[in-house]
């Protein structure tokens, strides 16, 4: 009776997430292998977030508009292992757009989602950032590795959204 | 008083190639990003090109992208267009600009008189 | 690209009366409650000239008489009471996303 029930919540739930997502990539996780937990389809999944790469370029705002239809942000990184895990399916000539920005140009990043900027935790290129002008983040590969560059907000470059992962 | 002064404009045959300059007063050149932007005769505005105030990033539109480069000299106060493989429709008044962040967008808040440039045989 | 639409494509207003222009973009140029057009004004054998900013915005310098609004896709520059020095080639302008684009022009003359 309890897995009966766990069942119907659960296809009631996905029922639920299939209006937004078309389909989703659910895996087993938790003590007992109980909880799935989910990601739309074809997004990549690292710990608890969902990350898409759009390669349609656009201006930060808009790259935010366009998360934010799907559910998502502009990607906050947070950790070393959560950006190697992100740049392994970037292309190496590219530039994409962070959920990162300082818009009075005042040298106050700040992340879409209100996380507190930690000047510890940033992987900004040598010399960066370098121009109160700039003010959106990307991440570029240059001089032979991953970080970030202060750019104009209005050139359009592709961008990185990251969701919650969907637990159901 | 801020004074942007364009030179370099002419008269030259289509697939050759110019060079503007855009001399500044009055501001600190360094700190500012630049812009190109140009008016053909009778026309409306077209911007043609930006580069940071650092001199490392560049933007174009794609119709002159590939055939056009903007630079500058801060140590000179001078911004530059070189323009190559012209065409009859890059006729026009070309005008630099500085400019200023809203945000994240911008505005071109001060503006040179212009150089004239004719394509023409 | 984003396309800047002006109307009308010239006017005639009497001294001292209303003039009014209006702007459409193609799409949003909104974000986080600011609006990315701006206005500028061309006087015969000048360069363009800033007049308004962020939509709504006035720039320093630049008389009161003059006031933009409107957000999303739709902007109107006014000018409550128009002075002979106001003959000109007015611009409106996107900044949210290269390449910026302007409209067509407005010209306006005294009636």
């Known amino acids: 009776n309890f897995m009966y029930s766990k069942t119907v919540k659960r296809l009631s739930k996905l029922q639920e997430y299939q209006q937004y997502y078309p389909s989703l990539t659910c895996v087993m996780e938790g003590k007992d292998m109980e909880d799935w937990s989910c990601c739309p389809t074809p997004w990549t999944s690292f710990q608890s977030s969902c990350y898409f790469i759009s390669t349609v370029m656009q201006s930060w705002t808009k790259s935010q508009n366009n998360c934010s239809v799907m559910g998502a942000d502009l990607v906050v990184i947070n950790t070393k292992e959560e950006q190697d895990f992100i740049t392994q399916n970037l292309k190496i000539n590219s530039a994409y757009f962070l959920g990162l920005s300082d818009p009075k140009g005042w040298r106050h990043w700040q992340w879409v989602d209100q996380t507190p900027y930690n000047k510890n935790v940033t992987f900004w290129h040598s010399g960066e950032p370098n121009s109160p002008d700039e003010r959106c983040a990307i991440i570029n590969f240059r001089s032979e590795e991953w970080g970030w560059n202060d750019v104009h907000c209005h050139v359009p470059q592709k961008s990185i959204c990251k969701m919650k992962k969907i637990y159901i | 008083e801020v004074q942007l002064l364009e030179s370099g404009g002419g008269l030259v045959q289509p697939g050759g190639s110019l060079r503007l300059s855009c001399a500044a007063s009055?501001?600190?050149?360094?700190?500012?990003?630049m812009s190109w932007v140009r008016q053909a005769p009778g026309k409306g505005l077209e911007w043609v090109a930006t580069i940071n105030s650092g001199g490392d990033n560049t933007y174009y539109p794609d119709s002159v992208k590939g055939r056009f480069t903007i630079s500058r000299d801060n140590s000179k106060n001078t911004l530059y267009l070189q323009m190559n493989s012209l065409r009859a429709e890059d006729t026009a008044v070309y005008y630099c600009?500085?400019?200023?962040?809203?945000?994240?967008?911008?505005?071109?808040?001060?503006w040179g008189q212009g150089t004239t440039v004719t394509v023409s045989s | 690209d984003i396309v800047m639409t002006q109307s009308p494509d010239s006017l005639a207003v009497s001294l001292g009366e209303r003039a009014t222009i209006n702007c459409k973009a193609s799409?949003?140029?909104?974000?986080?409650?600011?609006?990315?057009v701006n206005w500028y004004q061309q006087k015969p054998g000048q360069p363009p000239k800033l007049l308004i900013y962020?939509?709504?915005n006035l720039e320093s310098g630049i008389p009161d008489r003059f006031s933009g609004s409107g957000s999303g896709t739709d902007f109107t520059l006014t000018i409550s009471s128009l002075q002979a020095e106001d003959v000109a080639v007015y611009y409106c302008?996107?900044?949210?996303?290269?390449?910026?684009?302007f409209g067509g022009g407005t010209k306006v003359e005294i009636k």
């Open positions: 302008q996107q900044s949210d996303e290269d390449p910026w684009t």
């Open positions: 600009a500085t400019y200023r962040p809203y945000y994240y967008g911008s505005v071109l808040d001060y």
């Open positions: 962020g939509a709504s």
């Open positions: 799409q949003s140029v909104d974000y986080d409650g600011n609006s990315y």
């Open positions: 009055g501001i600190t050149f360094s700190t500012y990003t």
